[in-house]
């Protein structure tokens, strides 16, 4: 091992304080005891160390804890967290939500870094499921967090956690993710009355099946076009003109502007032109009068 430079006389650090910002890197290495640093980590964040000095402090902690830092140190890492690699973080066992919050705060306002992604992964795996408090915290820092999870990972979200989800948290979710989240939301909000239920379930409807959309059409919900356009095409196609009219209420006139886009375009192709004409919107492309409509999927199912 390389012989370490001795600490100059009178420079041995007795506490982590601002005098250390004037130490050269080799003096920090020689004069700061790693155990002292570990017990006074909460001070480091309040002292404007340079990035080079932070490198030295990290090195000292790495030597003291080669198997990974204890949570008492992790909680107070502050800006030193930005110096950690995903490999470092994989050695940690983070169980406290307060620790998670403290570290997310350091990265606040920035994109989710590989370090943060690894930290969250470690934390959630340690907990076994994505509970409400954790979800609350993660979506507060990263609104798109939920949609970054795979359908398999989303399956571990308990229905009770769905209460923490805000509409903007689902903005980037794809249909596969909403397919997983919708049944959980339906379960979570099942005891709410009609209008309140619709307000809560609306963001999740991209995962709703046809029968649920039919049920909603009987409840005067007045779904807006933006929500309608996010519905699963296969769930919209079987809806009748009357059901869509009831589902959208006053928003039905918006169909004209969307007639070339899915799922409206595909739905129009499945409706009788006579029925479409009853809407008075000038929607074209329906099945001409006198044509026989065969539901081949039903035929295949019977054979």
């Amino acid at each position: 091992e390389v012989e370490k430079t001795a600490c100059p006389s009178g420079k041995k650090a007795r506490e982590i304080d601002e005098s250390l910002i004037f130490y050269k890197k080799w003096e920090l290495e020689a004069c700061v005891d790693a155990a002292l640093l570990a017990t006074q980590m909460d001070r480091v964040n309040a002292i404007p160390f340079t990035y080079e000095q932070l490198d030295v402090l990290k090195h000292k902690l790495d030597e003291l804890y080669p198997q990974g830092y204890p949570e008492s140190v992790i909680q107070h890492l502050g800006y030193l967290f930005l110096k950690m690699s995903p490999e470092d973080i994989r050695k940690w066992n983070v169980t406290s939500l307060e620790t998670l919050k403290a570290l997310l705060e350091v990265n606040k306002g920035h994109e989710m870094s590989p370090q943060v992604a690894t930290l969250i992964d470690r934390f959630v795996k340690g907990r076994g499921q994505l509970d409400k408090d954790t979800l609350d915290t993660l979506t507060a820092f990263y609104p798109g967090y939920l949609c970054s999870l795979s359908p398999e990972e989303l399956s571990s979200v308990p229905p009770s956690s769905i209460w923490a989800v805000r509409p903007q948290d689902l903005d980037t979710c794809d249909p596969r993710q909403l397919d997983v989240l919708y049944p959980k939301a339906r379960l979570a909000f099942q005891n709410m009355n009609g209008s309140e239920y619709f307000v809560k379930i609306q963001s999740f409807l991209g995962g709703a099946p046809t029968e649920d959309l039919k049920a909603l059409s009987q409840q005067n919900v007045s779904m807006d076009l933006a929500t309608f356009m996010k519905l699963r095409t296969d769930a919209v196609l079987p809806l009748t003109v009357a059901e869509v009219q009831k589902l959208l209420g006053p928003h039905v006139e918006g169909l004209k502007a969307e007639e070339r886009h899915r799922p409206v375009r595909d739905w129009i192709l499945r409706q009788r032109q006579d029925d479409l004409d009853t809407l008075g919107l000038g929607l074209q492309g329906g099945i001409p009068n006198g044509y026989l409509v065969l539901d081949l999927s039903m035929q295949e199912a019977l054979s």
Epitope: G10, D17, E18, S19, F22, D42, A46
Partner: antibody
Framework: EVQLLESGGGLVQPGGSLRLSCAAS????????MSWVRQAPGKGLEWVSG????????YYADSVRGRFTVSRDNSKNTLYLQMNSLRAEDTAVYYC?????????WGQGTLVTVSS | QSVLTQPPSASGTPGQRVTISCTGS????????VSWYQQLPGTAPKLLIY???KRPSGVPDRFSGSKSGTSASLAISGLRSEDEADYYC???????????FGGGTKVTVL
């Protein structure tokens, strides 16, 4: 026990000069940044100047820059403030304090009066 | 006009809790630690809180500090007559290359 003892204050005419000293004991003076803070009669605290352990950079409030000079002699454990071109608004009690980011020890202060 | 803003006065009866605010900007409180100083009448200031929330030895735990964003606050719980003093907040400001103080808050015990 940490002790800071200021001296050199007194009555001086506008345009005159004074040199304040602060003798430090009870800690390793050469390891710590030092500062000067003043307080005009009946007013709040105003930071004047700061100097790191090695005197490498010196920091001054806009109100004194170009007129005051901070220095230190680590071999004598002493901090100095050379004040030139003094004005009536420089009248205050001048304190020396340990550190530059949080002043954990203060002297008792020395009064500087600038008046004709 | 001080760079950090404090209320000029605060008061309370013995035993009460008093809170003093200190508002700055991203260049001082937002990016650096806050300290609080107590100045009893006719004496030099004394460090009360450093690094936002730490108490030097000898300072009673009735005094507590906190920081959030560009603001900080000092709380005195269980107010006593000997707490009657001026209280100043302070922080380093890299944009000014200097230390800045609040204007001070006079705490009166009724």
């Amino acid at each position: 026990e940490v002790q800071l003892l200021e001296s050199g204050g007194g009555l001086v005419q506008p345009g005159g000069s004074l040199r304040l000293s602060c003798a430090a004991s009870g800690f390793t003076f050469s390891n710590y940044a030092m500062s000067w803070v003043r307080q005009a009669p009946g007013k709040g605290l105003e930071w004047v100047s700061g100097i790191p352990p090695d005197s490498g950079s010196k920091y001054y409030a806009d109100s004194v820059r170009g007129r005051f000079t901070v220095s230190r002699d680590n071999s004598k454990n002493t901090l100095y403030l050379q004040m030139n071109s003094l004005r009536a608004e420089d009248t205050a009690v001048y304190y020396c304090a340990k550190n530059m980011l949080s002043f954990d020890y203060w002297g008792q202060g020395t009064l500087v009066t600038v008046s004709s | 006009q001080s760079v950090l803003t404090q209320p000029p006065s605060a008061s309370g009866t013995p035993g009460q809790r008093v809170t003093i605010s200190c508002t700055g900007s991203s260049s001082n409180i937002g990016s650096n630690a806050v300290s609080w100083y107590q100045q009893l009448p006719g004496t030099a200031p004394k460090l009360l809180i450093y690094y936002n929330s730490k108490r030097p030895s000898g300072v009673p735990d009735r005094f507590s500090g906190s920081k959030s964003g560009t603001s900080a606050s000092l709380a005195i719980s269980g107010l006593r007559s000997e707490d009657e003093a001026d209280y100043y907040c302070g922080s380093w400001d890299p944009s000014l290359n200097g230390y800045v103080f609040g204007g001070g808050t006079k705490v009166t015990v009724l």
